[in-house]
Interface confidence: medium
């Protein structure tokens, strides 16, 4: 840090410099400090956000920004329809310029960009763009968040109504409504060429007060490809004077940016004022802490179908900054199928986003109830190729819960997959806040977004008059590096099933209040930051931001035939084509693993594998997805093992064991039934066997206890 002494009252943000002087017609002033002394403020220290209220009273208001947006608390507002953009597709003129204000980097827009719709009271004109970022390597830097997920960068575009005011500054000074769009930037493997003019400009304003003209850019290309899914709320400026005059539009889909491009933000300098000492420091973490929602309501857009593609990949396949917590988003496409009367097959697909590659292996956690007793096991799937496992020795009259977690290097873990419940003759799926009838066992329409850690210890709660008993399972984790990885699928007892009406009779709906909205806080020595995740009713696996995907298909046994061997570019554009089909990998005969017992550890993990990463922009090929955005997401096929015999009588009390799949050299395009005895409707696991998805209404991981190593049962 460079320090130098100034012998005059330092005004760290004076009038805009040379560029401003050449624009006498400009009414733009970026957080301008007049000589009369607009209050000095900073993002930390003695002039930090907690002190803003002393000089800007509005900063202590009850409708402040930014906020954390909880998707499941947001109501759909019919008035929030499509945004109308005008001028956004035009190239910017050579008068557009960028300035390092010392608090942000701002783009002063010199062209006419208008927005209307989205409930805005009129036609608003874009005035400026500002950025907020973190400190390094994609760390959290956004001001807003969704379900607790923050992003490396947030871009904010500010608008005013030119029919009411002659300038943006006038609107603010007269405390009149302005508009603001918040756009998240998320790390992607490759550079986003649309950002090139911005990144180039950043390199020209490294130092405080520097200004530069920008190369032409298209503002629309800095927005998400899909604009239909957005949140709306009324809030404030996120910097002093914190005026509560802002109609916020927060886009749910992020824009891709590479690590390399992020470095341009992290390279910006500012000058800080402490008494008479001015220091030159990096401008980093220039975000305001989040504010209370208080009595406000967050709305979400009512654009037709805008949210259908967006739930799974965002809400629990986070595209937000998770680098410090988990190594990947959850395994997806969970499926449970009966193989015969004493065996179940669990299959899944690789996570869509890997923060810390590679995945070494997977841990399957399963639990069951028998005569009111609750038992649980964890099993390490010692492969990154064959994404399925067989649980043998199952008992048809027990309820089974399954969930899967990826294990990465350094024992980092992914978020958990959704939990699948399986019980013979059960004919309902619990999906979000409703229970629906199902057909034959198939992939759940719910997604990994639906999984939530249910407990952090043994607790019994009563909600809406229905008692629940939850028992955590050992997961094989040391100190948790993920807020959500400290628990494994908790047992839902038969009491719960009775409460849900599974003992007979139909339930047409299931109140979300039945699930506790907050987990009891365990007295953990070190608490994880809590976050809440929606249990959605329409969550579909998605390829990532800015790519639309139709609902997952479940065309068993057909995928291999559809799979084409593509030639990938040097950067692997099509590297993960049809990646979910890896379980169809050729003949194998793999070792059988018994579920970990209390006195032994699970098999050692093994190797890595490729995985899809966050999407790379609307016009680029997404690894693992066809360029055709209408192509359906593929599903994990569930081949039936041909040679698995019942190992014990179904009536025995022997706990289930998990085995890796055994294959014969049969045609991979056709599913096979067990060779010894085809399943019939008379089998204990019949066509009427179903599975259920547990979707607690909220996920909060605060106070989760870390658990012992695999197989060490408590």
């Amino acid at each position: 840090v460079l320090h130098y002494v100034v012998c005059f009252p330092a005004l760290t943000e004076g009038y805009v410099g040379t560029l401003q002087e050449s624009r006498q017609d400009s009414s733009v002033q970026i957080r301008r400090r007049k000589a009369s002394g607009d209050p000095y403020w900073a993002y930390s220290g003695a002039y930090g956000p907690e002190h803003w209220v002393t000089s800007s009273v509005s900063c202590g208001g009850s409708h402040q920004s930014p906020i954390d947006i909880l998707d499941h608390h947001a109501r759909v507002g019919d008035e929030y329809q499509e945004l109308q953009l005008d001028g956004f597709d035009n190239e910017s003129s050579n008068k557009t310029w960028m300035k390092n204000t010392g608090k942000t980097v701002a783009i002063l827009l010199k062209d006419d960009y208008f927005v209307s719709g989205a409930g805005l009271p009129g036609r608003f004109k874009a005035e400026k763009v500002e950025f907020h970022w973190g400190h390094s390597n994609g760390s959290a830097g956004s001001e807003h968040s969704v379900n607790g997920r923050r992003f490396p960068v947030e871009m904010q575009i500010f608008f005013y109504n030119p029919d009411d005011f002659d300038s943006f500054q006038t609107a603010i000074s007269e405390n009149r409504i302005i508009g603001a769009m918040a756009i998240f930037f998320q790390v992607s493997p490759r550079d986003n060429s649309a950002l090139d003019p911005i990144i180039h400009g950043l390199k020209g304003v490294v130092h405080h007060e520097k200004e530069t003209f920008l190369d032409p850019f298209i503002l629309r290309d800095l927005l998400p490809a899909s604009l239909g899914s957005y949140y709306r709320y009324t809030g404030s400026l996120t910097t002093p004077p914190c005026s509560e005059i802002v109609e916020w539009i927060v886009f749910r889909r992020p824009v891709p940016i590479s690590y390399h491009q992020l470095e341009a933000f992290y390279s910006i300098f500012t000058t800080e004022q402490q008494d008479h000492v001015k220091s030159v420091e990096y401008l980093r973490n220039n975000f305001r802490p989040q504010q209370a929602l208080n009595d406000r309501v967050v709305s979400k857009s009512a654009v037709r179908d805008a949210w259908n593609h967006d739930l799974a990949d965002f809400l629990d396949n986070p595209l937000g900054t998770e680098a410090s917590k988990v190594c990947s988003s959850p395994p997806i496409h969970m499926k449970v199928q009966p193989l015969n009367q004493t065996a179940l097959q669990v299959s899944w697909s690789q996570p869509e986003t890997i923060y810390h590659p590679p995945i070494m292996n997977y841990m399957i956690s399963y639990s069951w109830t028998k005569n009111e007793d609750e038992k649980e096991k964890t099993f390490t799937k010692d492969s990154d190729k064959d994404l399925k496992a067989t649980i043998s020795h199952v008992s048809p009259d027990s309820l089974y819960l399954f969930r899967v977690q990826a294990v990465c290097r350094n024992d980092m873990r992914s978020d958990f997959s959704q939990t699948m419940l399986f019980q013979a003759n059960t004919t309902r799926i619990f999906q979000g806040t409703r229970i629906v009838k199902t057909g034959v066992p198939t992939a759940s329409p719910a997604s990994s977004a639906d999984m939530a850690p249910i407990s952090s210890g043994s607790s019994t709660w009563t909600s809406s008059g229905i008692p629940f008993s939850f028992v955590s399972m050992a997961t094989g984790m040391g100190p948790s590096s993920s807020g959500s990885q400290a628990t494994v699928a908790s047992v839902v007892t038969s009491t719960l099933l009775a409460g849900l009406g599974f003992g007979g009779g139909g339930i047409s709906s299931f109140p979300s209040t039945v699930w506790p909205t907050r987990l009891p806080t365990a007295s953990a020595a070190s608490k994880q930051a809590g976050r809440t995740v929606l249990a959605t009713t329409e969550a579909l696996a998605s390829p990532g931001p800015d790519v639309h995907s139709a609902p997952s298909k479940d065309s068993e046994g057909t995928e291999e035939g559809e799979k084409e061997e593509k030639s990938e570019s040097e950067d692997g554009e099509r590297e993960h084509e049809e990646e979910e089909k890896d379980s169809e990998k050729k003949e194998k005969s793999e070792a059988t693993h018994t579920a970990a017992e209390s006195d032994r550890t699970a098999p050692a993990p093994t190797p890595s594998s490729p995985h899809r990463t966050a999407a790379e922009g609307g016009h680029q090929t997404i690894p693992g997805r066809r360029q055709d955005h209408s192509a359906p997401a593929t599903d994990q096929p569930g081949h039936v093992a041909p040679d698995l015999d019942p190992l014990v009588d179904t009536a025995t009390q022997v706990p289930p064991t998990a085995t890796e799949e055994h294959y014969s050299g049969s045609d991979p395009r056709r599913p096979e039934m067990p060779s010894k005895k085809p399943m019939s409707r008379g089998d204990r696991f019949s066509e009427d066997s179903k599975f259920i998805t547990v979707n607690p209404a909220e996920k909060n991981t605060s106070g989760m206890l870390s658990r012992p190593s695999p197989g060490r049962m408590e």
Epitope: E263, H356, D382, D571, T606, S609, P610
Partner: antibody, heavy 120, light 111 residues
Framework: AQSLEESGGRLVTPGTPLTLTCTAS????????MSWVRQAPGKGLEWIGL??????TYYASWAKGRFTISKTSSTTVDLKMTSLTTEDTATYFC???????????????WGPGTLVTISS | SFVLTQPASVQVNLGQTVSLTCTAD??????ASWYQQKPGQAPVLLIY???RRPSGVPDRFSGSSSGNTATLTISGAQAGDEADYYC?????????????FGGGTQLTVTG
């Protein structure tokens, strides 16, 4: 174009520490696993270790303690070698994984290599 | 420790098809990559994830895997295919992570 280039290879006497540098162009090292691989004259390829995008390092068992990989910037990775013996004479390559979230020893970009000769 | 085994040398007649193998105890649970290296040059990635070909690699090169054996098949062998071929996989658990190279196979194209 994306490329790698090693530098720092030279003739040194046994026991002399040596640092090799791998310089990337066209991409950021924050996004990829970067491995060092060596090849003794007339022998096969031998993996030394890697550094991932987040700066975590992993080494072959024989390399632990004597070899250190570090990321010195978004475009350079160093391999520091100590306690060198004649057995360490080899061409040293740096190599980049094909895909940022792909880590199965699929290196699609290699440097041309730099020769390190240990001789007394 | 984990070892990938490759035949030291293989001969093939010009225009014929040749298969190079790579075996390991648990290769069925691992992905293999294949490299070609010509004298004095850096290796070139031919196949990754058992079967996938990077762009620019001729489709005469193909990969497969069955059980604990990964195979690189070169159809219509050409004189320019004479080189050393290495298979690679990964191994690891917990904080351990290794990239493992096979010993290499020297392919000679005759005729």
């Amino acid at each position: 174009a994306q490329s790698l280039e090693e530098s720092g290879g030279r003739l040194v006497t046994p026991g002399t520490p040596l640092t090799l540098t791998c310089t990337a162009s066209g991409f950021s090292l924050y996004s990829y696993d970067m491995s060092w691989v060596r090849q003794a004259p007339g022998k096969g390829l031998e993996w030394i270790g890697l550094i991932d995008g987040g700066g975590n390092t992993y080494y072959a068992s024989w390399a632990k303690g004597r070899f250190t990989i570090s990321k010195t910037s978004s475009t350079t990775v160093d391999l520091k070698m100590t306690s060198l013996t004649t057995e360490d004479t080899a061409t040293y390559f740096c190599a980049r994984e094909l895909w940022p979230a792909y880590s199965s020893g699929a290196f699609n970009i290699w440097g041309p290599g730099t020769l390190v000769t240990i001789s007394s | 420790s984990f070892v990938l085994t490759q035949p030291a040398s293989v001969q093939v007649n010009l225009g014929q098809t040749v298969s190079l193998t790579c075996t390991a105890d648990t290769l069925s649970r691992r992905y293999a990559s294949w490299y070609q290296q010509k004298p004095g040059q850096a290796p070139v990635l031919l196949i990754y994830r058992d079967t996938r070909r990077p762009s620019g690699v001729p489709d005469r090169f193909s990969g497969s895997s069955s059980g604990n054996t990964a195979t690189l098949t070169i159809s219509g062998a050409q004189a320019g295919d004479e080189a050393d071929y290495y298979c690679v996989t990964t191994d690891g658990s917990g904080s351990s992570y290794l990239v493992v190279f096979g010993g290499g196979t020297q392919l000679t194209v005759t005729g």
